[in-house]
Each structure stands twice: as structure tokens, then as C-alpha cells.
């Protein structure tokens, strides 16, 4: 998250971190006792790693009595999810067992109704992505207030050239951001999760180059088909 | 404890400009936001916009964008909005008031009234 | 812009009563709702912000409450040093918008 600040600690009990070999890889959210959401791409480069999802957490590293790491029984990309494209950028994580639930472990409502959220709405994204461009990680969970901007203006030449979808949505990104390893992680506006963040290579921090999020809410039907 | 201070009063010519200060104690300055907001005489509050003393990153309500600049000086816990090309319709009383990072505005000062006359 | 509207003016309440004032948004802010009070002498207060949460060292007998898009302030046992003017402000969607503000008076 660039120009963020460190988040309340386990004020977003949602929050997850998809883990490759024991380090941070992406964000996610978990949406189900047994399920967490997050980015297809981040899977890309993981054929033979250990996947795991930490819940629980708000710093990665200091021992945390809510923290728990659980090993991931399935992993289901969108089966229309491509390496070279930002679209369909979602997965869903089935964890070894259903997540101990708690005050710092609590899945999040998301959007079903598939409606645009309103240009100008702030929404809260967070994650333990790099927090500036030397590439510095934060041990704590940090977040950012967003607001939505228009798909036209995202589609613009100079902007994102058309690439925004019906199924994506964009926040304004000068200065403050998602960034790289927040990709997976939620866009939350009025306390319901309404995208995710894609994990596509996007300069961040740039104004003219808006963030990306996959929007939840297109893909209902998939999100409950995996889950039933 | 959080304390905001503004001048009481200013009163200038139309066509020209004003700069509106709001000095800050009490608090880190950089760990608060800060935002003015506008009241004409027995009129309601409007939000013109806010700074992150941080990294004077802005974000203005559009119907000010070309009216109102937020600024601040760090050195001296002090955060300033110039209004330019001054017109009758500018004068009101202006607040400054800290935080708001989630859109409240924890603490006020007690504003500055400003009169546009020739 | 979200429009805000309190259609309450101005209200009259004697000493004791139980007060409230509403607020309705021109769209559903989800509970990014505050309150201030305004007194006479233009000094403003943060009340109450999301909808329902006393700020610091804000008497108990006030609270809000409402989701969507209506929403009230109410004052429990009002006290002279409740007389002042409120305003609603939703902070759901930039630019950041204003309620007219209800005065109270008392009786």
C-alpha cells in the first residue's frame, strides 16, 4: 500500500495473507469458514511451492494470539483466468479446515447486486504489499481510503486504454495505492467487499495509471458454484 | 490537548487574494488531516477539501478546485488555505479541522471570518 | 454530489426532553454518517461519527442511529448547553456533503 497508514490491528478480521513457503506472497479475504478470495495470478509462479493462507494477522512476523497459518485443500483459479491478461483475475483458496472464527477472524460480506459502485465512493484497501517504490515490505497490515473513479475516465487513452471491463473497476491511484503484494487483497466500500485487487505488473502511485480491481460482484455465479 | 488556531478576522479587497492560517498544537501535526470547510452568514457548512500535512497530498471538492490552495508548513505546525480572485460571494467564515482520515472532523478551529469589500 | 437533508429547520424542546433529529441522504452512504453541534458563538463540535459512535468526552445522552440512507441524532435529557445548531455529514463519497443543520431552541 503506498501512502497509507498502518491499520488498526485486527480491525479487518476479513484480512488474509496468501503465503508461499512461509513468506508473503498476496492478500485475500476470507468470504467463507473455508474459504478465502484472492488474485489468480498470484498462484502463477507457486507449481512447486507450499501454499498456505494466514489469518488473524496483523503483523506478519510477532507472534499473535488470533494468528493462525492453515494449509490450502484446494486451489480454484477462474477458469478463464489467463498469464497475460488482467481479466477473470480471481481464486478462491478451500482451506484444510473451516477457519476458527473470532473477533480477529471473521469472513466479510461481499457484493452480489452487479451494479457499478458510485464514482467518488472511498473504499478501504489493505494489505502487507510494498509501502514505497524502493520496494519496502511492512511487517504490520497497512491501508489506504480510495476513491472509485469513473470506468470512461480509467478507459481513457492516456489511463488504461480501454482495457476496464464491465467486470473490473478502477480507484484513483496519485500517490496513494495498491501496490505489489497487495494484489488477492479486498476493496472494501461500505463495509462490503466489492473487488479484488488484480495482480497485474501496473506502476502504482501514478495518477494516470488508475488501480485495478476485479469486481466481485460479476462473478456471483462462479464465487457460489465453487463454494456450494 | 488538540488545539486549533485561527485569526478572528480578515478583511479584504475584491479581486485579490487571502491566505488563511490554521496553526496546529497539541498533537503530531503530520498524524492529523486537515480540512476547511466554508459557511456563508446563516448558511450551512460546505467541505471545500483537505491535506495530509504528511506529504501535502490534497483532495478538493471540484466546486473549489479553482478558488481554494491548501498548503502547509510542517516547521511550524501550520496549515493555510489561499483563496484567490475574491468576490463577494467568498465571504463567510472558514474553519480549519483536524483528522478526518475517515471523513470525520475530530477537532475544529474557531474560523476565520472573511469579508470581501471594496 | 450526495445530496443531505435535514427537513427539520428548527426545533423547540423544553428542558428534560428527549430530542431527535433526522437526516436523510440523496443515496445510501452505508453508515459513513457524522454529527456535529454548532454553538451560537460558531464554536463546532465532532458528536457522533459512523452513524453511532460517541466521539471522546461527548456527553452519553447523546447517540445516532439509522442505516441507509436515514439517519438521527437524538438527545436524551436535554440540557441548556445543548443549544446549538446540528449538522449531518456523510463521508461515504468525495466531495464530502453537509445537512442545512436543524437549530434547537428551547421552550
Known amino acids: 500500500i503506498l501512502g497509507g497508514r498502518e491499520a488498526e490491528a485486527h480491525a479487518r478480521p476479513y484480512m488474509a495473507s496468501v503465503q508461499l513457503n512461509g513468506a508473503h506472497l498476496c492478500g485475500g479475504v476470507l468470504v467463507a469458514e473455508q474459504w478465502v478470495l484472492s488474485a489468480a495470478h498470484c498462484l502463477e509462479d507457486a507449481a512447486d511451492g507450499k501454499v498456505q493462507v494466514l489469518l488473524g494477522a496483523h503483523s506478519l512476523s510477532q507472534p499473535e494470539p488470533s494468528k493462525r497459518l492453515y494449509d490450502v485443500l484446494r486451489a480454484v483459479p477462474h477458469p478463464d483466468s489467463q498469464p497475460d491478461t488482467i481479466d477473470h483475475d480471481l481464486l478462491l483458496l478451500q482451506l484444510s479446515e473451516k477457519a476458527t472464527l473470532g473477533p480477529a477472524v471473521r469472513p466479510l460480506p461481499w457484493q452480489r447486486v452487479d451494479r457499478d459502485v458510485a464514482p467518488g465512493t472511498l473504499c478501504d484497501v489493505a494489505g502487507w504489499g510494498i509501502v514505497n517504490h524502493a520496494g519496502r515490505r511492512p511487517d504490520s497490515l497497512q491501508h489506504v481510503l480510495l476513491p472509485v473513479l469513473d470506468r470512461a475516465t480509467c478507459n481513457r487513452a492516456t489511463h488504461h486504454d480501454g482495457a476496464i471491463t464491465e467486470r473490473l473497476m478502477c480507484a484513483e491511484s496519485n500517490r496513494r495505492d495498491s501496490c505489489k503484494g497487495d494484489s488477492g487483497g479486498p476493496l472494501v466500500c461500505g463495509g462490503v467487499l466489492e473487488g479484488v485487487v488484480t495482480s497485474g505488473s501496473r506502476v502504482c502511485g501514478n495518477a494516470k495509471k488508475p488501480g485495478i480491481y476485479t469486481r466481485v460482484a460479476s462473478y456471483a455465479a462462479w464465487i457460489d458454484s465453487v463454494l456450494a | 490537548q488538540v488545539q486549533l488556531q485561527q485569526p478572528g478576522a480578515e478583511l479584504v479587497r475584491p479581486g485579490t487574494s487571502v491566505k488563511l492560517s490554521c496553526k496546529a498544537s497539541?498533537?503530531?501535526?503530520?498524524?492529523?488531516?486537515m480540512h476547511w470547510v466554508k459557511q456563508r452568514p446563516g448558511q450551512g457548512l460546505e467541505w471545500i477539501g483537505v491535506i495530509d500535512p504528511s506529504d501535502s497530498y490534497t483532495k478538493y471538492n471540484q466546486k473549489f478546485k479553482d478558488k481554494a490552495t491548501l498548503t502547509v508548513e510542517t516547521s511550524s505546525s501550520t496549515a493555510y488555505m489561499q483563496l484567490s480572485s475574491l468576490t463577494s460571494e467568498d465571504s463567510a467564515v472558514y474553519y480549519c479541522a483536524g483528522n478526518g482520515y475517515d471523513g470525520s472532523m475530530d477537532y475544529w478551529g474557531q474560523g476565520t471570518s472573511v469579508t470581501v469589500s471594496s | 454530489d450526495i445530496q443531505m437533508t435535514q427537513t427539520t429547520s428548527s426545533l423547540s424542546a423544553s428542558l428534560g426532553d428527549r430530542v431527535t433529529i433526522s437526516c436523510r441522504a440523496s443515496q445510501d452512504i452505508s453508515n459513513s454518517l457524522n454529527w456535529y453541534q454548532q454553538k451560537p458563538d460558531g464554536t463546532v463540535k465532532l458528536l457522533i461519527y459512523?452513524?453511532?459512535r460517541l466521539h471522546s468526552r461527548v456527553p452519553s445522552r447523546f447517540s445516532g442511529s439509522g442505516s441507509g440512507t436515514d439517519y438521527s441524532l437524538t438527545i436524551s435529557n436535554l440540557d441548556q448547553e445543548d443549544i446549538a445548531t446540528y449538522f449531518c455529514?456523510?463521508?461515504?463519497?468525495?466531495?464530502?456533503?453537509f445537512g442545512g443543520g436543524t437549530k434547537l431552541e428551547i421552550k
Open positions: 459512523y452513524t453511532s
Open positions: 455529514q456523510q463521508a461515504n463519497t468525495l466531495p464530502y456533503t
Open positions: 497539541g498533537y503530531t501535526f503530520t498524524s492529523y488531516w
